[in-house]
Amino acid sequence: MADGSSDAAREPRPAPAPIRRRSSNYRAYATEPHAKKKSKISASRKLQLKTLLLQIAKQELEREAEERRGEKGRALSTRCQPLELAGLGFAELQDLCRQLHARVDKVDEERYDIEAKVTKNITEIADLTQKIFDLRGKFKRPTLRRVRISADAMMQALLGARAKESLDLRAHLKQVKKEDTEKENREVGDWRKNIDALSGMEGRKKKFES
């Protein structure tokens, strides 16, 4: 594969580990066919931004986890009243235990019914999934090359839909096997549409496959 690395990739590295191609390399090929564009952001700045994005993502995840904990607490507080034992004696506590046992039995029955429904749904989902696999079985899935994840992709993975609102998330290009015909690719789905649509793509496939 031709070396189309950016400034960040050219900077000296402490260990001569095999270079994993960045998605930005491929993006450069796709968007600027005839001229390599110098990165406007230095490697240290990129790292700083990536760290910042990770921190934001971490905070967001922590906040979501806290929200879930709070929601669980609220749900439990509505279902489980405080025991309020002050002033109650042995007789009332006996009766309270009976009441709570009756409540537990009722909840257990409900849980059993829900579990039965869930099991039924899981079975149905498994059956449908199997049917999908059976239908897709005749098509060979292309093997995808691993690329170093970009800050954009990392944010999308961590924040999901929210990242799209604030960041320019670009599609990752994927490696294609020589033997995959156009017909098969069309049948498999839209995964290559964006790449094939780009100008001069056919002429540079060899670079991806080297």
């Epitope: 009243q81 405080p82 309020e84 034992l85 002050a86 002033g87 109650l88 004696g89 042995f90 007789a91 009332e92 506590l93 006996q94 009766d95 309270l96 009441q99």
Partner: antibody
């Protein structure tokens, strides 16, 4: 000084309904379970209802279950007894009492003066 | 329901006497027994809880004892202000139940 004052009693016909109130003072009301106890014309004492300190749990004897409802308003330091489908055997002096406990033993440590309820056709 | 019974519905005694009022439960109530005093004007007061514990502000002339199904309240050196009706109440099992009461009178 711990004090309980009942009100709302009266004379009514069988099948009627009535709501008794008990205003408590002299202690932290929300920390205590409360009870209603009645005394029949024959001078027998009968436990009628108990409610936990926060109002989540209530207890009744079979004789009033489904007809009587004990409730409380901790903000107003007031205990209530809603009585429906009253019968002649519900005729009694109704006392409001504070509950306390000691190693599982519960008791009514302070009582009000009582409110008279008469059910007669 | 646990039935509570007193041996006598009324008792006559003289001032200064030692008076014992008995109470029996239809089954073991594991010391969950309380004693109350009702004055002629209708006011009710707790005297003894958990068989033998004296409630605050109650004269030490009052004492309680017993276990299992048999319990008693003792008034040593009877005074005029002790003339009242005495009730025992079990707190072992719901419904909470009282006895019919023992009316204490002067001879």
């Amino acid at each position: 000084e711990v004090q309980m004052v009942e009100s709302g009693g009266g004379l009514l016909k069988p099948g009627g309904s009535l709501k008794l109130s008990c205003a408590a003072s002299g202690f932290t009301y929300s920390n205590y379970a409360m009870s209603w106890v009645r005394q029949t014309p024959e001078k027998r004492l009968e436990w009628v209802a108990t409610i936990s300190s926060g109002g989540s749990y209530s207890y009744y004897p079979d004789s009033v279950k489904g007809r009587f409802t004990i409730s409380r308003d901790n903000a107003k330091n007031t205990l209530y007894l809603q009585m429906l489908s009253l019968r002649s055997e519900d005729t009694a002096m109704y006392y409001c009492a504070r509950r306390d406990n000691y190693f599982g033993s519960s008791f009514m440590d302070y009582w009000g003066q009582g409110s008279s309820v008469t059910v007669s056709s | 329901d646990i039935q509570m019974t007193q041996t006598s519905s009324s008792l006559s005694a003289s001032l200064g006497d030692r008076v014992t009022i008995s109470c029996r439960a239809s089954q073991d109530i594991t010391n969950y027994l309380n004693w109350y005093q009702q004055k002629p004007d209708g006011t009710i007061k707790l005297l003894i809880y958990y068989t033998s514990r004296l409630h605050s502000g109650v004269s030490s002339r009052f004492s309680g004892s017993g276990s299992g199904t048999d319990y008693s309240l003792t008034i040593s050196n009877l005074e005029q202000e002790d003339i009242a009706t005495y009730f025992c109440q079990q707190g072992n099992t719901l419904p909470l139940t009282f006895d019919t009461g023992t009316k204490l009178e002067l001879k």
